[in-house]
């Protein structure tokens, strides 16, 4: 069987400051088994922004039902944007492990871009 | 603190049908997941079926066709319509919460069916 | 489909530690959990996603992986363990729920 992917395919997205940033992301399979984290920027730094495991993540609502079985649409929404969250977004797939689960594939990074309001 | 009990239990004859409930508080109801899950008298736990919290919904395969698992979410019911039952369907029915992954983590003190002649 | 073997039934003194195994499935498919059940009782989830305890159980429960094998550790048994335990799993491949045939422990 195909090895999973993760697909992220928009390279930018620029929203307005107050409005609402779609970041879409699918994956190519359902095996390993294992949760979608994303984050904002890459390397030991980088800021967890919504985790399909556990957390309270109130900015950010999933595009599609996560409890489906079949589901591999991980896209988020992250509403009332503000410059502070402009940078560079990665889906990153883990698969399970014990104690912690490990990094298995990420996506190739959308760039978030924020337009100030006019004033 | 999360809580499921189940109702609509009850003896029935072989054919006939039954609706059990799951009224479901302590929780966001409408967020998660859920399965119903039964134990035949004096066996193991038997997977029946569960369902998304957007509806989507699977089926153990000795009750495809026959039982349908459904829910509403602004009532915080989870429902299972049982048809056509036979002898095998007795059992306590267990509706249980899913975990992101799809285990259980809260299960219902459980609701007897028996199908007799 | 897949099948999830345990033992029947396992047997432990007070203060001892228990062990019930379960094997069956794909280590990269298949989440796992433990689940325990008292007589005339509900069951009550001990252990999912293969390790993670929930905050109400005792610590004296712990899960571990290896391969195809799954196993349910209870350090320092007590009378109150005593109990069917059924293993269970979720594959990601099928979407199926699977139960083992479920473990008696009998405190002696």
């Known amino acids: 069987e195909e090895e999973l992917q993760v697909i992220q395919p928009d390279k930018s997205v620029l929203v307005a400051a107050g409005e609402t940033a779609t970041l879409r992301c699918t994956a190519t399979s359902l095996i390993p088994v294992g949760p979608i984290q994303w984050f904002r920027g890459a390397g030991p730094g980088r800021e967890l922004i919504y985790n399909q495991k556990e957390g309270h993540f109130p900015r950010v609502t999933t595009v599609s039902d996560l409890t489906k079985r079949n589901n591999m649409d991980f896209s988020i929404r992250i509403g009332n944007i503000t410059p502070a969250d402009a940078g560079t977004y990665y889906c990153v797939k883990f698969r399970k492990g014990s104690p912690d689960d490990v990094e298995f594939k990420s996506g190739a990074g959308t760039e978030l871009s924020v337009r100030a309001k006019p004033s | 603190d999360v809580q499921l009990v189940e109702s609509g239990g009850g003896v029935v004859r072989p054919g006939e049908s039954l609706r059990l409930s799951c009224e479901a508080s302590?929780?966001?109801?409408?967020?998660?997941?859920m399965s119903w899950v039964r134990q035949a008298p004096g066996k193991g736990l038997e997977w029946v079926a569960g369902?998304?919290?957007?509806?989507?919904?699977y089926y153990g395969d000795s009750v495809k066709g026959r039982l349908t698992i459904s829910r509403d979410n602004s009532k915080n019911i989870l429902y299972l319509q049982m048809n056509s039952l036979t002898a095998e369907d007795t059992a306590v029915y267990y509706c249980a919460r899913e975990t992101w992954n799809h285990l259980f983590d809260y299960w219902g003190l459980g609701t007897l069916v028996t199908v007799s002649s | 489909s897949y099948e999830l073997t345990q033992p029947p039934s396992v047997s432990v003194s007070p203060g001892q530690t228990a062990r019930i195994t379960c094997s069956g499935g794909?280590?990269?498919?298949?989440?796992y959990a433990w689940y325990q059940q008292k007589p005339g009782q509900a069951p009550v989830t001990v252990i999912h996603?293969?390790?993670k305890r929930p905050s109400d159980i005792p610590e004296r429960f712990s899960g571990s992986s290896s391969g195809t094998t799954v196993t349910l550790t209870i350090s320092g048994v007590q009378a109150e363990d005593e109990a069917d335990y059924y293993c269970?799993?979720?594959?990601?491949?099928?979407?199926?729920?699977?139960f083992g045939g479920g473990t008696k422990l009998t405190v002696l």
């Open positions: 794909d280590y990269y498919s298949t989440y």
């Open positions: 369902i998304s919290s957007g509806s989507d919904t």
């Open positions: 996603s293969d390790d």
């Open positions: 269970g799993g979720y594959d990601g491949r099928t979407y199926i729920n699977t």
């Open positions: 302590g929780f966001t109801f409408s967020s998660n997941a």
